[in-house]
Interface confidence: low
């Protein structure tokens, strides 16, 4: 036999929790547990569905799961069938609505003094409470003029009055929780006394001097009151006028009349209505002053021709908003066609030559006109006037290539040198006519130069070649001043360069012949050993036939290049000790000597009582300091050559000496002591 | 509005390519001289190459071989082909207009940059 | 290729102070040289071009000098706005090369 373990009962329930309806059979062979709701089987969903042989609600739904559920033990086998005692929820919920109008049947029957029923549909189970409200603050039952009936959920306005008029809303609360209405209603009650509006003045714009005029009316019964008031709170009547609004009329409908407005008028107009009952109505107009900017400036336009241009034309600041339009030769504009307006813009399609001249934008509202013309040129394609040549040009003197072309606007030139921009500089000058001119022409000038000549419409180029005459000048130039070594082998270079190649030879200033040891070797002076009388004055001669001659100066010294006699050598002295580096140097001229100490020359004029140089060049420092170390450089010079030699000076301090050193000890590292 | 817009840029594998894009507005590249610049984090300006208007390129002695400059003047775009990219050319790329003649012409124009991070 | 060789590479000066830039070309440029200011995030700014020459909506208070291989930038009263970094662009072209050198830099710093 299927018994029963556990048995769904009856439970009270929560709409949208979780529920459980418990059922556990027993039964010798196996048997299957299924669910019934109202004798009809229950089927699985993600809210609703079987755990074990008990059922489980994961969301109880108060309309879905209202019944009776039982649950069903079948052997299958044996067809033996159980089935347990029935189960219900008894299930609390509670869910909001809107205030709706239940009597009169529609809003437009609502009048002053008949009964008016709203209704709460806020429906809830166990049933709720109904609290009402208006304007937000609850109303308490028994309150004058109105009554709740909470078993209906309804709220009776007993007559209705204009005291009655505001948003209803209601909420309801139960064991379950609370809600409150999803919509609310309007109740609007008119009182006759109330003043309302009938015609509200509105905003005006008006050119100085015009009259402006504001419109105002209330109703009410009785008549209400009408008072008009400017900005600062002064009242403006026909026998009260402010001092600035002399001009101002009040008609008996309630309008105003202002005449010959001034800027001190402009401002905020409030008319203001007040019922025999109820508020004041507050209605406000400004009065603006028309006015009306300056036009910013165009530029100069540049089109080119079979294009489709626009220029737009920015309506200056203005009130009312400017209206703008276009005209060209003093007519207006077109809104479609070749050459037409198109809202602020002038649009300019397929452009021709013929389309260029003087556009003119104007702008105009109450406070006036304002214009702004736009020149508008039509850019052509420049033509030659001359184009570059093929040139000869001479080294070191100016060279110009022209480059000569009209277009409307006027062209741009640029030159390029072998497919370089050509960019002015102390060299390079370009003429406002297009003209290249080249300073002082350089040998490699030579080369092919291309001018462009450019509008919006198009280029055109064309390029020459330079060609450049080379002057006949010294390559490098001789240095004019030259040492050549005693009894030694020695050369004198010159060389040239020009138009054709120079030749070149080498005479003595004297006019008298070099001597046999003295070569002449295609411009190089070739001494095979230099003697004293070698020295003197030489001159380099270049010539060719188209160019003549130059010449170039050279004096000769002969010199025995400078050697040390003595070097300064590495020197460690005592601090206080007297410190002395030898340097000697022979040559011819006899050589100078120049001490340089810690990287600065020491000079003998300013060398201070401690150091001091000798006639024979040696460096003495007395009473050495440790800033004294360093390295010391000797600089022999003369008119020919320059040489020089370095040893370091170290100061070290004098040592103490200790008891096991005898009285005779030398210092452990090579030392002057003085 | 006369204006230079580079794009292309991002993170890229030592080794790898990139090609950054420069499109003009306002005004034809056909008729300018552009270079580009680029700008290491925390870096000074260090000019890469430039491309004249006859299609003449020029290049900075470091970028020659691995970076080059093209254009198409249909599209107003100058481009930078960048091959075999090393970590130290992360940097900032701008692109420029005029700057070769800025010292003539007084006047230089010059893109927003674009960021390009190789890295592995 | 040309080097440009700005000094110094940093310089801390207060508001109302003269400052002064130096840019050395490795060889001569004549007046081929521009001025650029440039602040963190932004694009550079021209200055001062022809070395000499002051940029369209640049202050009079920037000024440049110079030819060949020597130039200086001249701020006459520091403003607040003037801290920034300064470089110097030289440009060189001859028939087989052509190109552009920035200096190193000069970050102008509150002092």
């Known amino acids: 036999a299927i018994v029963f373990i556990k048995q769904p009962s009856s439970q009270d329930a929560l709409q949208g929790r979780r529920a459980l309806l418990r059922c556990e059979v027993e039964a010798p062979g196996p048997v299957h547990v299924y669910w019934l709701l109202d004798g009809a089987p229950v089927q699985d969903t993600e809210r609703r569905f079987a755990q074990g042989s008990s059922l489980s609600f994961a969301a109880v739904d108060r309309l879905q799961d209202s019944g009776t559920f039982q649950c069903v033990a079948r052997d299958d086998v044996t067809g033996e069938e159980a089935r347990s005692a029935n189960a219900s929820f008894n299930i609390k919920w509670i869910e909001a609505g809107p205030v709706v109008l239940k009597h009169p049947a529609s809003e437009a029957e609502i009048q002053p003094q008949t009964q008016v029923t709203l209704r709460c549909h806020i429906d809830g189970h166990p049933r709720p409470t109904y609290q009402w409200f208006r304007d937000g603050t609850p109303l308490s039952d028994g309150q004058s003029n109105h009554t709740v009936s909470s078993k209906e959920r309804n709220l009776t306005l007993r007559p209705a009055g204009p005291e009655h008029s505001g948003l209803y809303s209601c909420c309801a609360h139960s064991a379950f929780g609370q809600a409150c209405s999803s919509q609310n209603f309007t109740l609007s009650i008119a009182d006759e006394s109330f003043a309302r509006v009938v015609l509200a003045p509105q905003d005006v714009v008006v050119a100085r001097y015009e009259e402006a005029m504001f419109h105002c009316q209330f109703s009410a019964q009785p008549p209400p009151s009408l008072q008009w008031l400017f900005e600062d709170e002064t009242p403006i009547t026909n026998r009260s006028r402010p001092p600035h609004l002399r001009r101002a009329t009040v008609f008996a409908n309630g309008s105003l009349l202002l005449t010959q407005v001034r800027p001190r008028n402009a401002g905020i107009y409030r008319c203001i209505g007040q019922g025999q009952r109820g508020p004041p109505i507050i209605l406000e107009a400004t009065l603006h002053l028309a006015e009306i900017e300056d036009m910013p400036l165009f530029e100069p336009r540049v089109f080119t021709a079979g294009s489709e241009e626009r220029v737009t034309c920015l309506p200056p600041k203005g009130l009312p908003e400017p209206s703008v339009w276009w005209e060209h030769a003093g007519v207006r504009l077109p809104t479609h066609g070749r050459v037409y307006q198109k809202g602020h813009e002038l649009v300019l399609a397929n452009i021709a030559e013929s389309d260029a001249g003087v556009y003119t934008c104007h702008a105009a509202n109450l406070a006036g006109q304002r214009r702004q013309d736009v020149n508008i040129t039509v850019a052509t394609v420049p033509s030659w006037l001359k184009k570059p040549q093929d040139s000869q040009l001479e080294e070191g003197k100016p060279g110009y290539l022209d480059c000569l072309t009209q277009a409307t606007p006027k062209p741009t030139v640029v030159w390029y040198r072998n497919q370089m921009l050509i960019s002015e500089d102390s060299r390079f000058e370009v003429f406002k006519n297009g003209t290249l001119r080249i300073n002082s022409v350089e040998v490699y000038d030579g080369t092919w130069y291309r001018c462009m000549s450019s509008t919006p419409a198009g280029s055109i180029e064309a390029q020459a070649r330079v060609q450049v005459l080379e002057k006949l000048k010294f390559t490098p130039p001789p240095q004019p001043q030259q040492c050549m070594e005693f009894d030694k082998e020695a050369t004198v270079p010159c060389s040239a360069t020009g138009r054709e190649k120079p030749t070149i030879k080498w005479e003595r200033a004297d006019g008298s012949s070099l001597p046999e040891w003295v070569t002449d070797n295609a411009g190089t002076l070739h001494f095979a050993r230099v003697t004293r009388d070698d020295a003197g004055n030489y001159t380099c001669i270049a010539s060719n036939g188209p160019q003549g001659q130059i010449r170039a100066h050279v004096q000769l010294t002969v010199a025995v290049f400078i050697t040390f006699k003595v070097e300064p050598e590495r020197t460690t002295v005592y601090q206080g000790h007297t410190a002395l580096l030898q340097c000697e140097a022979q040559g011819d001229p006899k050589p100078l000597i120049q001490w340089k100490g810690k990287d600065r020359i020491l000079d003998p004029t300013k060398l201070g009582p401690r150091m001091h140089i000798f006639q024979n060049g040696s460096l003495v420092i007395h009473d050495v300091a440790p800033e004294d170390s360093g390295r010391y450089t000797c600089i022999a010079g003369n008119s020919c050559n320059i040489k020089h030699t370095e040893a370091p000076l170290y100061v070290v301090d004098k040592p103490v000496p200790e008891e096991s050193e005898g009285p005779g000890s030398p210092p452990p590292y090579k030392m002057i002591q003085t | 509005e006369v204006q230079l817009v580079e794009s292309g840029g991002g993170l890229v594998q030592p080794g790898g390519s990139l090609r950054l894009s420069c499109t003009a507005s306002g005004f034809s590249l056909s008729t300018y001289a552009m270079s580009w610049v680029r700008q290491a984090p925390g870096k000074g300006l260090e000019w890469v190459g430039m491309?004249?208007?006859?299609?003449?390129?020029y290049y900075a002695s470091w970028a020659k071989g691995r970076f080059t400059i093209s254009r198409d003047t249909s599209k107003n775009t100058v481009y930078l082909q960048m091959n075999s990219l090393r970590a130290e050319d992360t940097a900032v790329y701008f692109c420029?207009?005029?700057?070769?003649?800025?010292?003539?012409?007084?006047?230089?124009?010059w893109g927003q940059g674009t960021l390009v991070t190789v890295s592995s | 290729e040309i080097v440009m060789t700005q000094s110094p590479s940093t310089l801390s000066a207060s508001v109302g102070d003269r400052v002064i830039i130096t840019c050395q070309a490795s060889?001569?440029?004549?007046?081929?040289l521009s001025w650029y200011q440039q602040k963190p995030g932004k694009a550079p700014k021209l200055l001062i071009y022809?070395?000499?020459k002051l940029a369209t909506g640049v202050p009079s208070r920037f000024s440049g000098s110079g030819s060949g291989a020597e130039f200086t930038l001249t701020i006459s009263s520091l403003q607040p706005d003037d801290f920034a970094t300064y470089y110097c662009?030289?440009?060189?072209?001859?028939?087989?090369?052509?190109?552009?050198?920035f200096g190193q830099g000069t970050k102008l710093t509150v002092l």
């Open positions: 420029a207009r005029d700057i070769g003649i800025s010292y003539y012409i007084g006047v230089s124009l």
């Open positions: 060889q001569s440029i004549g007046t081929r």
């Open positions: 662009l030289g440009e060189y072209s001859y028939t087989t090369t052509a190109g552009i050198a």
């Open positions: 022809g070395a000499s």
């Open positions: 491309i004249y208007i006859n299609d003449n390129t």
